[in-house]
């Protein structure tokens, strides 16, 4: 009897491994061995393909053949008993556009509020991704434990630190690599779980801006309590990508170590031209806080992008805000030209309920006050460059108080 | 102004120890590696190790672990390279040079090391 | 370990005449951690390039890094008498950071 020849072949590859699976075309014929030869491109003659000769199962691996996984290569199987069906051919294939991503490897940190993830390729050292390694990017699916309620972070890089979480909690997480230049998304990783630790008992600090003031910069942070020190660090922004590179290193400030006040000032050529990530510790002589939310800092924008100043008309149910360009030190203003997006916040002195208006005129109307009260409002620019996408940091509060209830017209 | 001072030229008999040194000043000396780089005379460069002064992270190249130890005292800024039991091999200029994501944007001026019976 | 080759290993040109340096490397690296300096004798090493492509501060633009994954190129447009020297490729990518063999340019 004829043997048939072996159909519907099947090409996985999941990273640098290349997995064959096929169908029997003959289930009622017992002892039946497959074997595969494999070309390359531009040439004539066929190779017997190691790792999958004679074999008994309707799977195999030839992951250890040495391919240039950007070279076209064709596969061919057969049947053998006593003798052997026809080939049957399988369309050619590139091994680099056929390949999926793996699962990449992920280990957590837990902090009270916070969970760093740190993720590598799931293959180390991959020949498939070999000149792509860098490009990886990553997305993640992160939820409570106890309500299963998913939030999907995007565009993530091998070091990763998720904020405001819950101490004592249960969060689980799962993480698939992608690379967007060649338009692949992997496979998720195993959910892994962390718990959160105790509610440290000094919290990191909040609210870190930078501003320009003559040839120096200013860094401010809020803080909940009085008497501490503060230290603060700095690292190349593009290092986030590389974080296993022996550089990937915080450094030391050394006008903004050991400081007792929330701001520090330090000179504007300790940074050359770049985008930095700047993070600040507190500590009472005893206990150390976390570190805080990162702050990304690009000395081109920070130089240029400075808070909007405005004057305010106060009416009995409204401000008129009239936005004017910032000034530089000596009081002259700053010339931008650039398109800028004005975000005016404001709220009653009273309580620390704020709201928030978007515009992009220089004269805003805030609607709806109350008469005879006081209101603060701060205020920031962003750049409608999408490329660009900075924002200054916000004015000083200016708080003012509206008319009695007749002056609205 | 970013200055690395090298330690002076040494002649050495083979089996004896040496430590030579390499000060740094003008810059942020726990901010930044620190470099040992190994040129035989008329040979090419050759990375021995890294040292981070800031937290002491030490890292050998393959072919250097193991026949030198690499050290720093940030309190008076200065780094270290030195031999237990040195062999005629060891004979060569030896640099030291600060290390950060420009390369090794800084070099001091070497120092002569010859291990001659 | 990563291995840089360079190539090639003596290039013999006249001043004004386009050098063209190569180094290779075993395994991809980051153009991010490649750097080129040059030596000349009895001196320490000067850094050119870092970056792949970046111009480390009074290097002038004569000189122009390219390149990425494997391949990278050191080129200098109109070779100048100072230009004479011993060339070295490196990379940091790894911490067990490795300098190319050098390429020699000589005056022809």
């Known amino acids: 009897k004829n043997l048939k020849s072996p159909q519907k072949v099947e090409v996985d590859i999941i990273d640098d491994n290349f997995i064959l699976r096929w169908n029997r075309s003959d289930e009622s014929v017992g002892n039946v061995t497959f074997s595969f030869d494999y070309q390359k491109t531009g040439m004539d003659n066929w190779i017997k393909l190691s790792g999958c000769q004679n074999i008994t199962s309707t799977k195999c691996n030839f992951s250890s053949l040495k391919l240039n996984v950007y070279e076209e290569i064709k596969l061919r199987i057969r049947a053998e008993k006593e003798n052997t069906s026809s080939w049957y051919e399988v369309d050619s294939f590139t091994p680099f556009r056929k390949a999926q991503i793996g699962p990449p490897e992920v280990h957590l940190e837990a902090e009270d509020k916070a969970i760093v993830i740190h993720i590598s390729p799931g293959t180390k050292d991959s020949v498939m991704w070999a000149l792509d390694g860098l490009s990886f990017t990553y997305s993640l699916v992160i939820w409570k434990n106890s309500s299963g309620v998913e939030e999907r972070i995007e565009n993530i890089y091998s070091r990763h630190k998720i904020y405001k979480l819950s101490p004592e909690t249960t969060y689980c997480l799962k993480v698939k690599a992608a690379l967007l230049t060649s338009w692949k998304i992997g496979v998720y990783s195993p959910v892994h779980c962390i718990k959160t630790t105790v509610e440290n008992e000094l919290p990191p600090p909040e609210n870190i801006e930078v501003s320009v003031q003559n040839q120096n910069y200013v860094l401010k942070w809020d803080y909940t309590y009085a008497n501490m020190t503060f230290q603060v660090q700095w690292l190349h922004a593009f290092l986030k990508r590389n974080p296993g590179n022996h550089l990937y290193k915080w450094k030391q400030i050394p006008d903004c170590e050991n400081v007792k006040t929330t701001q520090c000032v330090f000179p504007q050529n300790v940074f050359q031209k770049g985008i930095y990530l700047l993070r600040v510790q507190a500590s009472d002589g005893n206990n150390t806080s976390f570190w805080s939310e990162e702050i990304k800092f690009d000395t081109e924008i920070q130089a240029f992008l400075l808070p909007p100043v405005f004057n305010i008309r106060s009416l009995s149910d409204s401000f008129h805000i009239y936005i004017g360009a910032p000034k530089q030190s000596g009081n002259t203003p700053v010339i931008q030209d650039y398109p800028l997006i004005y975000e005016i916040i404001f709220w009653e002195n009273t309580s620390n309920a704020e709201r928030k208006i978007i515009e992009k005129k220089t004269d805003v109307t805030v609607p709806n006050l109350k008469p005879l009260t006081v209101y603060c409002v701060k205020a920031r620019a962003h750049t409608m460059d999408e490329k660009l996408n900075k924002s200054s940091v916000f004015s000083d509060a200016v708080c003012e108080k509206t008319k009695p209830g007749n002056t609205s017209k | 102004e970013v200055q690395l001072v090298q330690s002076g030229a040494e002649v050495k008999k083979p089996g004896e120890s040496l430590k030579i040194s390499c000060k740094g000043s003008?810059?942020?000396?726990?901010?930044?590696?620190i470099a040992w780089v190994r040129q035989v005379p008329g040979k090419g460069l050759e990375s021995m190790g890294i040292?981070?002064?800031?937290?002491?992270?030490?890292r050998y190249s393959p072919s250097f672990q193991g026949q030198v130890t690499i050290s720093a005292d940030k309190s008076i800024t200065t780094a270290y390279l030195q031999w237990s039991s040195l062999k005629a091999s060891d004979t060569a200029i030896y640099y030291c040079?600060?290390?950060?994501?420009?390369?090794?944007?800084?070099w001091g001026r070497g120092t002569l090391v010859t291990v001659s019976s | 370990e990563i291995v840089l080759t360079q190539s090639p290993g003596t290039l013999s040109l006249s001043p004004g005449e386009r050098a063209t340096l190569s180094c290779r490397a075993s395994?991809?690296?980051?153009?991010?951690?490649l750097a080129w300096y040059q030596q000349k004798p009895g001196q320490a090493p000067r850094l050119l390039i870092y970056?792949?492509?970046s111009r480390a501060t009074g290097i002038p633009d004569r000189l122009s890094g390219s390149g990425s994954g494997t391949d990278f190129t050191l080129t200098i447009t109109r070779l100048e008498p100072e230009d004479f020297a011993v060339y070295y490729c490196?990379?940091?990518?790894?911490?067990?950071?490795?300098f190319g063999g050098g390429t020699k340019v000589e005056i022809k």
């Open positions: 003008g810059y942020i000396f726990t901010n930044y590696w």
């Open positions: 490196q990379q940091y990518d790894s911490s067990a950071i490795t």
């Open positions: 040079a600060r290390h950060d994501i420009e390369g090794f944007d800084y």
């Open positions: 040292i981070y002064p800031g937290d002491s992270d030490i």
């Open positions: 970056g792949a492509s």
């Open positions: 395994q991809s690296v980051s153009s991010s951690f």
